[in-house]
């Protein structure tokens, strides 16, 4: 069995985590996908998920989490904007495939968010970035609830993560009540 591996990402408060989870295109393109946090000894907690079936390049927002599923590229893009220290933790992308157990995409992301000035011109420590005013978008009927530990028998797809550049802008379409602001890192 393949060991569950982690990639560590250290970011400052206010920055954006940008994760790309690769999946097998032909098999999972339209499958529903989710972003979960994993805490020791607990069931993984589903924080946000795509629609069922998953729509191509259609942003889904829940709070500060934005999911976009790019069918053509076989990747789920997950962004957590305006990071807070309490966002620190272990995360994973999963693909729902009822009635079978969810399929976990690897590597897991170990996110460490620290306080502190990121040193970007034009930003300051006291500034707050109210990136979104978002109505709730997920419902119980749309999003499956759990995943569970499972044995991995083959080398899984790898996830990659990066931080947005200082002049990047969160530029989403078809999303209600978005206030677009630059995210300084």
């Amino acid at each position: 069995a393949t060991k569950l591996t982690e990639e560590k990402y250290e970011l400052k408060e206010g920055q954006t985590l940008d994760v790309k989870c690769d999946y097998t295109l032909e098999k999972f393109a339209s499958s529903q996908k989710a972003w979960q946090i994993i805490r020791d000894g607990e069931m993984p907690k589903t924080l946000a998920c795509t629609e069922r079936p998953s729509k191509n390049s259609h942003p889904v927002q829940v709070g500060r989490i934005i999911l976009e599923d790019y069918h053509d590229h076989g990747l789920l893009r997950v962004r957590m904007v305006n990071l807070q220290v309490e966002d620190s933790g272990l995360y994973q992308c999963v693909i729902y495939q009822p009635p079978k157990e969810p399929h976990m995409l690897f590597d897991r992301i170990r996110l460490v968010v620290t306080k502190g000035f990121s040193g970007t011109p034009g930003s300051n420590e006291n500034s707050t970035q109210n990136v979104y005013k978002i109505p709730p978008t997920t419902t119980k009927a749309l999003c499956p609830l759990y995943t569970s530990p499972r044995t991995v028998t083959q080398a899984p797809p790898k996830s990659t993560a990066d931080v947005s550049t200082p002049d990047s802008e969160i530029n989403l379409t078809n999303v209600t009540d978005i206030i677009r602001v630059p995210v300084f890192n």
């Epitope: 946090i37 805490r39 000894g41 607990e42 069931m43 993984p44 907690k45 589903t46 924080l47 946000a48 829940v62 709070g63 500060r64 989490i65 957590m80 807070q84 309490e86 966002d87 729902y96 495939q97 009822p98 009635p99 079978k100 157990e101 969810p102 978002i134 709730p136 119980k140 999003c143 499956p144 609830l145 759990y146 569970s148 530990p149 499972r150």
Partner: antibody, heavy 121, light 113 residues
């Protein structure tokens, strides 16, 4: 409509093992969307979560009871079970089984009617 | 463990009047990343199992009358029955599912004045 029904002995002697089964009807216990849980309520008191299980067998227990609790699942019978060992009078309670969607919605959304278990010699 | 404290222990309200039940958690149950509070409210009538009323602190479960509403965030939550009906006589519990183990409040008994 999903229904849950607890069954098992209503009287257990101290130091013995309490065994209960929950039968799920109107839906599949093998749903990938849910866990299945046990909760208890001593007479005239509040609710205590005992633990939950996924159809694949993954279990999660309340640390206060973990050393004495075993929850198992039998998907072929659409049932899950609770065993609580070394019982004392303090384990006297109504035991409920429930569908556990707590990780996503924060809730136990379908409950059985409950079964009263008395621990006495 | 997160300790859930409900107040008052009991409440007597006239028919048609507002009933308010409070629940306080010993630590925040809000996931700020998805802006959801992992708190639920249940109603338990004598001899019956609990019934889910509210999840995510403020979302009514399907089929629950709209006189029941939940509010609050972080550590302080409220269940409000806007116009008490005779069938609302019950014990009400809050529950957190933010951290294991799931824990419940001690309950609030609602009666008719």
């Amino acid at each position: 409509q999903l229904q849950l029904q607890e069954s098992g002995p209503g009287l257990v002697k101290p130091s013995e093992t309490l065994s209960l089964t929950c039968t799920v009807s109107g839906g599949s216990i093998s749903s990938s969307d849910y866990y299945w849980g046990w909760i208890r309520q001593p007479p005239g008191k509040g609710l205590e979560w005992i633990g939950s299980i996924y159809y694949s067998g993954s279990t999660y227990y309340n640390p206060s009871l973990k050393s004495r609790v075993t929850i198992s699942v039998d998907t072929s019978k659409n049932q899950f079970s609770l065993k609580l060992s070394s019982v004392t009078a303090a384990d006297t309670a109504v035991y409920y089984c429930a569908r556990d969607s707590g990780q996503y919605t924060g809730s136990l959304d379908v409950w059985g009617q409950g079964t009263m278990v008395t621990v006495s010699s | 463990d997160i300790v859930m404290t409900q107040s008052p222990d009991s409440l007597a309200v006239s028919l048609g009047e507002r009933a308010t039940i409070n629940c306080k958690s010993s630590q925040s149950v809000l996931y700020s990343s998805n802006n959801k509070n992992y708190l639920a409210w249940y109603q338990q009538k004598p001899g019956q199992p609990p019934k889910l009323l509210i999840y995510w602190a403020s979302t009514r479960e399907s089929g629950v009358p709209d006189r029941f509403s939940g509010s609050g965030s972080g550590t302080d939550f409220t269940l409000t029955i806007s116009s008490l009906q005779a069938e609302d006589v019950a014990v009400y519990y809050c529950q957190q599912v933010y951290l294991f183990p799931w824990t419940f409040g001690g309950g609030t008994k609602v009666e008719i004045k």
